[in-house]
């Protein structure tokens, strides 16, 4: 839009807002059980972990903000089996952490998730 | 879980992680048109804005993280009507910003959205 019609400061604020909404890795709360694939008798404590996942807007409505690079970070969680026959076990769970994002036209066939050791 | 079984530092790290995943207002990217209710001939630029929305985990699976208090913040956006007969108009769009969140058992009847002036 032509800058001549509007106050340059207003345009700057709008532009900064747009930049902040762009597709990038954002800290997200992820439910471990859902990511792992729910098992009715296995629970985790805490049930959620913080990781970075791609999110935000793209320059085109038809594009999807998706991860292009991923690192796996290990989270220490209590694994609880029901019925509780033993002490909850402290296990390392590897969670996908998106380190790079890109606006892409199609969803990948194999979305990154969680790897259990 | 009894702290005697585990290293106190490990427990502290787990607890901090859990606190950070708790239900609270989080900065979120929101698509304005979707929030407003899509009109085929009215578009916004930028199409997305940053606001705080309730998100995160609850202690029980049956609870949902929902807003208990909301403020409305005004965002300056270009409103584009199609077919484009005039210069895109700079309009104030009021967007719901969640200021308080709580883990509640049911979804509210009227989710907060966007108010147009």
């Amino acid at each position: 839009f032509a800058a001549t019609f509007y106050d340059i400061e207003t345009l700057k604020v709008i532009d900064e807002e747009w930049q902040r909404t762009q597709c990038s890795p954002r800290e997200t709360c992820v439910e471990v059980a859902s990511e792992l694939g729910k098992s009715t008798n296995t629970f985790f404590k805490p049930p959620c972990v913080n990781v970075f996942r791609c999110g935000g807007c793209c320059n085109e409505e038809s594009l999807i903000c998706m991860n292009t690079s991923t690192s796996y970070i290990s989270k220490q969680l209590f694994e609880i089996s029901v019925p509780l026959t033993s002490v909850p076990e402290l296990v390392p769970v590897k969670v996908a952490n998106h380190t790079g994002c890109k606006c892409l036209p199609t969803a990948p066939r194999h979305p990154y998730s969680i790897i259990r050791r | 879980f009894a702290a005697t079984f585990y290293d106190i530092e490990t427990l502290k790290v787990i607890d901090e992680e859990w606190q950070r995943t708790q239900c609270s207002p989080r900065e979120t990217c929101v698509e304005v048109a979707s929030e407003l209710g899509k009109s085929t001939n009215t578009f916004f630029k930028p199409p997305c804005v940053n606001v705080f929305r309730c998100g995160g985990c609850c202690n029980e699976e049956s609870l949902i993280c929902m807003n208990t208090s909301t403020s409305y913040i005004s965002k300056q956006l270009f409103e584009i009507s199609v077919p484009l007969t005039s210069v895109p108009e700079l309009v104030p769009v009021k967007v719901a910003n969640h200021t308080g969140c709580k883990c509640l058992p049911t979804a509210p009847r009227h989710p907060y959205s966007i108010i147009r002036r």
Epitope: F1, A2, A3, L11, D15, W18, Q19, Q22, C58, N59, E60, E61, S62, I64, K102, C103, P105, T106, A107 | F43, K45, P46, P47
Partner: antibody, heavy 118, light 112 residues
Framework: QVQLVQSGAEVKQPGASVKVSCKAS????????MYWVRQVPGQGLEWMGY????????TYNQKFKGRVTMTTDTSTSTAYMELRSLRSDDTAVYYC???????????WGRGTLVTVAS | DIVMTQTPLSSPVTLGQPASISCRSS???????????LHWLQQRPGQPPRLLIY???NRFSGVPDRFSGSGAGTDFTLKISRVEAEDVGVYYC?????????FGQGTKLEIK
């Protein structure tokens, strides 16, 4: 108003490279993807790829992958398209086109004729 | 790649009469988000293409209301209610649902 001003016509030898520029004005350059489309004289339109000026991310048509590079200079609001290893069938008018959030190529440059001949 | 097939390739029309161009895609153009990214472009002789219609039926800025777009899935139509002399040129359909973006081969509109 939105304007896309392209560089002038070029004549190149087979095997050489060409770099076409497209200077944008009248809008926020980083808020829109820039497409590159070519048209062989008397023929239809062919999409080469696009660049997101916000972060430099590119998506190319597989047909041109390895031969084409799209870049931007946000300080001057200019997009560039470089095509390498030119062949005679690359003789075409090369257009830059801004793409709206809703998908249509809404503003076009006037085109740059690239002639490849020995 | 998505193949876009236009018919007819040439359309001689009398001034003031209607004209219709068809565009068929080799795959559905409905995006996973529910939108259909099918657009129509006009290219007058010696000029760059110009956007007429986007997302099937939305007329772009300054496009006369005699132009209209319709269709769904794989079959789309551009209609001109009353052809005027300035409408002479080549019309292209294009899709931006899939990569690579592709165009129809063009339909030449000429006056009888």
């Amino acid at each position: 108003q939105v304007q896309l001003v392209q560089s002038g016509a070029e004549v190149k030898q087979p095997g050489a490279s060409v770099k076409v520029s497209c200077k944008a004005s009248g809008y926020t350059f980083t808020g829109y993807n820039m497409y590159w489309v070519r048209q062989v004289p008397g023929q239809g339109l062919e999409w080469m790829g696009y660049i997101d000026p916000y972060n430099g991310d590119t998506t190319y048509n597989q047909k041109f992958k390895g031969r084409v590079t799209m870049t931007t200079d946000t300080s001057t609001s200019t997009a560039y398209m470089e095509l390498r290893s030119l062949r005679s069938d690359d003789t075409a008018v090369y257009y830059c086109a801004r793409t709206s959030y809703y998908g249509g190529m809404d503003y076009w440059g006037r085109g740059t004729l690239v002639t490849v001949a020995s | 790649d998505i193949v876009m097939t236009q018919t007819p390739l040439s359309s001689p029309v009398t001034l003031g009469q209607p004209a219709s161009i068809s565009c068929r895609s080799s795959q559905s153009l409905v995006h996973s988000n529910g939108n259909t990214y099918l657009h129509w472009l006009q290219q007058r002789p010696g000029q760059p293409p110009r956007l007429l219609i986007y997302k099937v039926s939305n007329r772009f800025s300054g496009v006369p209301d005699r132009f209209s777009g319709s269709g769904a899935g794989t079959d789309f139509t551009l209609k001109i209610s009353r052809v005027e002399a300035e409408d002479v040129g080549v019309y292209y359909c294009s899709q931006s649902t899939h990569v690579p973006r592709t165009f129809g081969q063009g339909t030449k509109l000429e006056i009888k």
